[in-house]
Amino acid sequence: IWSAVFLNSLFNQEVQIPLTESYCGPCPKNWICYKNNCYQFFNESKNWYESQASCMSQNASLLKVYSKEDQDLLKLVKSYHWMGLVHIPTNGSWQWEDGSILSPNLLTIIEMQKGDCALYASSFKGYIENCSIPNTYICMQRTV
Amino acid sequence: IWSAVFLNSLFNQEVQIPLTESYCGPCPKNWICYKNNCYQFFNESKNWYESQASCMSQNASLLKVYSKEDQDLLKLVKSYHWMGLVHIPTNGSWQWEDGSILSPNLLTIIEMQKGDCALYASSFKGYIENCSIPNTYICMQRTV
């Protein structure tokens, strides 16, 4: 992040930006920036694979939930959206697109129906769903 | 906003930031930044007046809805939260804290009970509620 104060002195702006204020990002244009992560909610319903491809085409991935503190904005998300969590039938675990395992106590996993993909819903709930079912989705980009 | 590309060349960073990426803000620390507006959701339930005071103490105001396009992140907000919309009994209009009148077709106004304050709920709905009822609230800061 570029401290707003640093930028302010650097460019000798007239507007004084309080020390507590800062810039967030960088993020793709018109994405949500929160605690230096970038999020975008996509209205168009796609299956999990298409959703993943859409995020990848924007240099992002499907939502990864890694911290209730850093991602507390997710508490208030309405509806159900594909996230990057998939079931590995060989060992029965749930893992993210990057291969990391779902940390315990991060998500409450609820079985909607038999499936290997998961939808994110408010208050850190993950709903197991058939990967081929079209749903809206959340892309995420972690800043450098 | 500081274009990420501009910052990148200025500081001669090694990481290449795509032209389509940009910084958002400035915002108070740990607030949500979206389309250069800053938002924060407060969990603690307060009446409308206390909510307003809380936002003001953070150099912000209660949520003002002014554009469905610029504020489309509000579509997916779960639950009910105080916003800066109040009823003016003398002329029967609804206006924001800054004195501006609620634009037509921005919010669907629904009466919960008799009241002069309004709660924001998903999909651009405003619920009329008694100002003394404690609720969570949304603060907003528009960037310079």
Epitope: - | S79, Y80, Q113
Partner: antibody
Framework: EVQLLESGGGLVQPGGSLRLSCTAS????????MSWVRQAPGKGLEWVSL????????YYADSVKGRFTNSRDDSRNTLYLQMNSLRAEDTAVYYC?????????????????WGQGTTVTVSS | DIQLTQSPSFLSAFVGDRVTITCRAS??????LAWYQQKPGKAPKLLVY???TLQSGVPSRFSGSGSGTEFTLTVSSLQPEDFATYYC??????????FGPGTKVDIK
């Protein structure tokens, strides 16, 4: 004037079906949850079903679950109660009511507008 | 399931009397309690909601109070048009509504 008008009641044999309608006027129908409440002859009020403002959530009393279906058509400002597998104990006056229940909200503000009721008699 | 009981089930009173009806819940509930008035052959009418808030247009002689498991509806000075049956109603945590058995208020 805010009004609810029920119709569709009548005499039906046990095991039969009936569809009640409730037409709303004078308020924004699509913005409110709607309930059905019934009252058996000489008895008290019994809540039957609620449908949320969006129509996405429906709730039923245990006594009617699996037999009754509550639905709404916002374009017609109309609420419906489809009643199947009717029993003698379903005999009652059925009221529809505008319900100030808001999904996920901490307070409940009651059923503030009621229809005049329609009588359903289940008898052979 | 939370049960509601009302007492008395029948009440005989004079015009001008102060009348109190009690509604008890089988376990503690929030303030999501409402009171309705019903006259013979008519639909119920909402009087009080959220335990103590008077519905618009309802005379101020009606009032509601209570918390936890015990709630009351009071009519400070009974009028001829107040003779009716009164029901309390409670909303459980998910939308399932329970009505009390009713209290019939009659002219003495």
């Amino acid at each position: 004037e805010v009004q609810l008008l029920e119709s569709g009641g009548g005499l039906v044999q046990p095991g039969g079906s009936l569809r009640l309608s409730c037409t709303a006027s004078g308020f924004t129908f699509s913005s409110y949850a709607m309930s059905w409440v019934r009252q058996a002859p000489g008895k008290g009020l019994e809540w039957v079903s609620l449908i949320s403002e969006s129509g996405s959530s429906t709730y039923y009393a245990d006594s009617v679950k699996g037999r009754f279906t509550n639905s709404r058509d916002d374009s017609r400002n109309t609420l419906y109660l489809q009643m199947n597998s009717l029993r003698a104990e379903d005999t009652a006056v059925y009221y529809c009511a505008k319900d100030r229940w808001f999904e996920g909200y901490h307070s409940y503000y009651g059923m503030d507008v009621w229809g005049q009721g329609t009588t359903v008699t289940v008898s052979s | 399931d939370i049960q509601l009981t009302q007492s008395p089930s029948f009440l005989s009173a004079f015009v001008g009397d102060r009348v109190t009806i009690t509604c008890r819940a089988s376990q503690g509930i929030s303030n999501n309690l409402a009171w309705y008035q019903q006259k013979p052959g008519k639909a119920p009418k909402l009087l009080v909601y959220a335990t103590s808030t008077l519905q618009s247009g309802v005379p101020s002689r009606f009032s509601g109070s209570g918390s936890g498991t015990e709630f009351t509806l009071t009519v400070s000075s009974l009028q001829p048009e107040d003779f009716a049956t009164y029901y309390c109603q409670q909303l459980k945590s998910y939308p399932s509504f329970t009505f009390g058995p009713g209290t019939k208020v009659d002219i003495k």
